[in-house]
Interface confidence: low
Amino acid sequence: LNTILTPNGNEDTTADFFLTSMPTDSFSVSTLPLPEVQCFVFNVEYMNCTWNSSSEPQPTNLTLHYWYKNSDNDKVQKCSHYLFAEEITSGCQLQKKEIHLYQTFVVQLQDPREPRRQATQMLKLQNLVIPWAPENLTLRKLSESQLELNWNNRFLNHCLEHLVQYRTDWDHTWTEQSVGHSHSFSLPSVDGQKHYTFRVRSRFNPLCGSTQHWSEWSHLIHWGSNTSKENPFLFALEAHHHHHH
């Protein structure tokens, strides 16, 4: 099979959605494309492969099979743990023992009522790993004006890169700093009159894979005088921090 990489590094092959053995003069169900399957490996603990079940013209329990191309794991496997949306299959969850990051993962979606209506995708799982958010954030004072932020990840540190954001209660926007594989960050000039807020997120890139997606943001951690009564930005920040993905 000749393969062409898509921009995110994934091969993406599907059954052609117009070809049926009967001439199709109307745009019938058999000519419809199947929804795209999106897979993400969460911290290499489990993988969710999901699709938009509402794109089907009528409620359809699509089935999913998978295998690994050109490997010892090339036996076709049925999904054993479906995810549902309004009682219709909308995904499949695979457990850790079924995940082989560095083999080509082949996933096939099929309409059981129209077996010819199937779509196959090939995915590079090492480009689809999303780590858990950094946790156990701690701040310590290194000197009168210097703060150090530390955190942990539930994954191999060398596989992750990290992004720190911080702001004071007087800032309109976050200041962002990439810290590579380090899991600490130093802020050299802290203003004792201001309230600081920090958060961190991580990405599986670039040593072990090339995932473009970041983890969720960590919980916020704060430092300094609390001046939120005088400044509305801190309230907005607290209320909306979960939307910064």
Epitope: L1, D12, L19, T24, F27
Partner: antibody
Framework: QVQLVQSGAEVLKPGASVKVSCKAS????????MHWVKQARGQRLEWIGG????????TYNQKFKGKATLTTDTSTSTAYMELRNLRSDDTAVYYC?????????????WGQGTLVTVSS | DIVMTQSPLSLPVTPGEQASISCRSS???????????LEWYLQKPGQSPQLLIY???NRFSGVPDRFSGSGSGTDFTLKISRVEAEDVGVYFC?????????FGSGTKLEIK
Amino acid sequence: QVQLVQSGAEVLKPGASVKVSCKASGYTFTEYTMHWVKQARGQRLEWIGGIDPNTGGVTYNQKFKGKATLTTDTSTSTAYMELRNLRSDDTAVYYCARRRRYYGYALDYWGQGTLVTVSS
Amino acid sequence: DIVMTQSPLSLPVTPGEQASISCRSSQSIVHSNGNTYLEWYLQKPGQSPQLLIYKVSNRFSGVPDRFSGSGSGTDFTLKISRVEAEDVGVYFCSQSTHVPFMFGSGTKLEIK
């Protein structure tokens, strides 16, 4: 690398039939559908239809039903298009094109084209 | 059948300038799954057509980033940010949301 090599030019008389071939290499033939496109001089490209070599399923442009018949031979990785009852307005270059099985659904590799000339 | 209308028919461009080609479909080519299957092809003189853009804005493998596609619903545009001599040829838009697939009439890009 992917290659689609078509049969040579044909000169035919009105009423005749012709079978154009398209030999595929560089990929697994049964995993992609094959489509045919007509390009008459000064006219826009016209999609004739497509065939799934895996199942033999065919979808035609209504305009070419009865004119074109699409088949494949998986043992030789070759697609065929037969044109029947040729008329002068069938004079054109005919292309085979592989349809990528991405969610982009596009004709990603094309043959070099076969010129069919119908003349009395 | 859906009609794909392209403009202009001819486009003379100075090397290094931007070129813009418009394509309009006679009805929406948004599929019920939310995707829009609109492609752009380039046919260089004496050659077969080649795929440039699929699904409105996705560049095909090996296509230079000076080519970009945009649009939605029924109106689509192909832009070439800095035209080079090798870009000459006829550009076709095509829809593959509905059967039959339909192509635009083509836009001939020429170097001034």
